[in-house]
Each structure stands twice: as C-alpha cells, then as structure tokens.
C-alpha cells in the first residue's frame, strides 16, 4: 500500500537498442523520488539511479555483464525529502518490470553501409560492424562479435532506373552481388536475427547509390 503521498511506478518498459538499455516508467514524480533495482533471476538486487526525479534509468552497465541472462528490475517510490519513510508494511512502495533478456530482445540498431566497390559486373557491399557496449577482456564487442552467425544482413539492391528490389543475404558483413554493366544501383541493408520471433529486424540503413562518393568503381 505505501505511504499516502507516494504512488507506485507503472508502465515499466525496457527500451533497448544494440544493448544500450534504459528502463522507463510513469508517472512524472510529484513530491516523490525513485530508486531502481535490477537483478538476474538467481542474483542479488543491485540499486541504481538513487532517489532520482527522472522516469528513466540507464541499466546498460548491468545487463552487458551477461546479455544472455534474464533480468528483472523494480522501481521504488519514496516521498521527496523523506526517503526513509516506508509503507504500512514497513517497505517502500515498488513495482516490478517485465522480465528482459537482452540477447533475445534488444532492438537491432539501424545499420550503415560502410562502402561498396564495383569490379566489372560484381559489386562488393560492406556493412559497418557497429560497436556495442558489451565488453570482453576490456574491449567493446561489435554486433557481429556478440551475435555471431545468429545475425544476418539482408541487402536490398535495385537499378536506379527501376523500382523492383532484389535481395541478397549474408552471415558476414559483406555481400558480393552480380550487376548489369553500365547500370547504376542503389543499396539498403537490414539486420535480421532469424531465430527470433519478435524484434527480428532493424530499420533499414540509409540508401546509398552508385555514383556517390561512398563507392568506388573499377573497370576490369
């Protein structure tokens, strides 16, 4: 039940892209503050964002310790200026978040086409391997490092003069596609984790077209 002048947080929502993970909730505080705790299913609670008036808390540092674990968070409500005050049961008011498994649920960020190079009737398109905040041996891992072959990229490519999009797929960060000589093509890529049932796809990368400075053309 809690004290009469605090309300429990509600609409606890995980917002996560490429493992950058923020817990959001409502309401905007009026004469109250919040503290967040996070734990794995079997672990101890760790407090974050102490006595904040924000309605979000960045939990990235905690979840990147093991992205395959399932996490639970809870948001405590305290009266402003009297954080020792507790509810009628002797505990501050709190609300639990939904469970969150970063590896299965983090959204895939918008990919970027790093470069493309044409050699005759072949074009090699390279996707930037985006850095995440997941660390191993004190270095930040890339998206490919974390997901390995679970992550594929779909390339959409089309003649500048036409609308139909052909597709190619790769479980590396490179595509090698056949093109018609003398035609300019445009490209867009999408990250996909086919083994997922939700949050399977990223938004599309910005479109890059031949004849612009990202690419290189070599006639063989």
């Amino acid at each position: 039940s809690g004290t009469t002048n605090t309300v429990a947080a509600y609409n606890l929502t995980w917002k996560s892209t490429n493992f950058k993970t923020i817990l959001e909730w409502e309401p905007k505080p009026v004469n109250q503050v919040y503290t967040v705790q996070i734990s794995t299913k079997s672990g101890d609670w760790k407090s974050k964002c102490f006595y904040t008036t924000d309605t979000e808390c960045d939990l990235t540092d905690e979840i990147v310790k093991d992205v395959k674990q399932t996490y639970l968070a809870r948001v405590f409500s305290y009266p402003a200026g009297n954080v020792e005050s507790t509810g009628s049961a002797g505990e501050p008011l709190y609300e639990n978040s939904p469970e969150f498994t970063p590896y299965l649920e983090t959204n895939l960020g918008q990919p970027t086409i790093q470069s493309f190079e044409q050699v005759g009737t072949k074009v090699n398109v390279t996707v930037e391997d985006e850095r995440t905040l997941v660390r191993r041996n004190n270095t930040f891992l890339s998206l490919r490092d974390v997901f390995g072959k679970d992550l594929i990229y779909t390339l959409y490519y089309w003649k500048s003069s036409s609308s139909g999009k052909k597709t190619a797929k790769t479980n590396t960060n490179e595509f090698l596609i056949d093109v018609d000589k003398g035609e300019n093509y445009c490209f867009s890529v999408q990250a996909v984790i086919p083994s997922r049932t939700v949050n399977r796809k990223s938004t599309d990368s910005p479109v890059e077209c031949m004849g612009q400075e990202k690419g290189e053309f070599r006639e063989i």
Partner: antibody, heavy 120, light 107 residues
C-alpha cells in the same frame, strides 16, 4: 499458431481486376517477408512476387510486372495482391507464403490458396 | 534468372521403395535449396531446407544432399502418405525459382 489465410479469389473477365488478401495470425508480418506464389491448374509452382512489409519493398516476376501490385497493411497484419489487366493465363490458385529471411530462407508457412479464374 | 531443372517429371514406385529426385541449378546457388511436398488440393509443405536440413516435424526417411549445383531429395522407404508431387526451389537470388515438379505415383 502461425496461419495464413487467402481470400478474394473468384471468376473475372479478361482485362478485369481482382484483389486478393492474405491475413496472417500468430506472427507479425512486418517481422517477415511475404511472397505470393501461383499454380495454374495441373501445372507447377510459379513465384509471383514479394513484399517486405517493414519497408514496402517489392519485386515481381516478369510475367506480372506492371499488372500486379503487392501491398501490406501492418495494422491489419494483412498482405494484398492487386491484379489488373487479367489474362486467361493468370488463372491459378494463388498462395501467400511466409519467408523467415534466414540465410536458408525457404517459405516455412503457406496459406491454403484461393482460386482465380479468368474467363469470358 | 536461375533455372531449376527437376527430374524425373513423374515416377511410379511401391511402398517400401527408395526414391530419388534430382534438381540441377543453372548456376551456383550455394546450399540455398528447399524441397516441398504437395498433395492434390493442398498447399505445399516444407520438407528440406538449406539443401540437407530436415524441417521440424518431417519424418527422417526424407533426406536431402548437394553436389555442386546438383541437389537430391531421397525418400529411404516410401510410405503410403508420401504419394504426392515434390518441388525443389532455389532462394539464393531474386527471383526465387521452382523446379517443374516430380509426381510420385503408386506402381
């Protein structure tokens, strides 16, 4: 349970139009790619075209290009095949199928099909 | 477009027979070949993906293999419910293309 249900088939005159629907349940179409495949009576399977509902990208078989248009309404979780300037050779059972977009990416679920007959 | 040439177009066999159907791609398609089974009045059903992987729920008497651009579907011991038409499909490039089909009939 994943399900695809086609509807909208029927008898139409040459030169006429028809719109087929493919209603999906058990998954969100914007997370997948949806294909249309047809089968003329007593014949084999012919790919018609695809749509990626997440971005609206499409591609069509040469035999239908300029006459058929695939679209999707993600709020209704439904894909559509708009068929214009229909010809006798478009007579077929039309199937929609789900593509999980994996590297091995075959069509893992198909609808039951809807028959389109083009005849005067 | 990549052509998938399937043979034979039909075959007669008895229950318990070993049946082999082949598909040849007109160019390299890596392992991006699937096999489907279709019964009259029904939609195709996925049997094999990535040339040799058995799809979930498909009996182990079905198998697939690849040698270069040649792909084979084998039914080790034909069962009464296996009498149907079988199609190969490449999904390596757009447009995806199907073989012409092989009808497996009762001898």
């Amino acid at each position: 349970e994943v399900q695809l249900v086609e509807s909208g088939g029927g008898l139409v005159q040459p030169g006429g139009s028809l719109r087929l629907s493919c209603a999906a349940s058990g998954f969100t179409i914007s997370d997948y790619v949806i294909h249309w495949v047809r089968q003329a009576p007593g014949k084999g399977l012919e790919w018609v075209g695809y749509i990626d509902p997440s971005n609206g990208y499409t591609y069509y078989a040469d035999s239908v290009k300029g006459r058929f248009t695939i679209s999707a309404d993600t709020s209704k979780n439904t894909a559509y095949l708009q068929m214009n300037s229909l010809r006798a050779e478009d007579t077929a059972v039309y199937y929609c199928a789900r593509d999980p977009q994996s590297l091995t990416s075959p069509f893992d679920y198909w609808g039951q099909g809807t028959l389109v007959t083009v005849s005067s | 477009d990549i052509q998938m040439t399937q043979s034979p177009s039909s075959l007669s066999a008895s229950v318990g027979d070993r049946v082999t159907i082949t598909c040849r791609a007109s160019q390299d398609v890596n392992t991006a070949v699937a096999w489907y089974q279709q019964k009259p009045g029904k939609a195709p059903k996925l049997l094999i993906y990535s040339a040799s992987f058995l799809y979930s729920g498909v009996p182990s008497r079905f198998s697939g293999s690849r040698s270069g651009t040649d792909f084979t579907l084998t039914i080790s011991s034909l069962q009464p419910e296996d009498f149907a038409t079988y199609y190969c499909q490449q999904h390596y490039t757009t447009p995806p293309t199907f073989g012409q089909g092989t009808k497996v009939e009762i001898k």
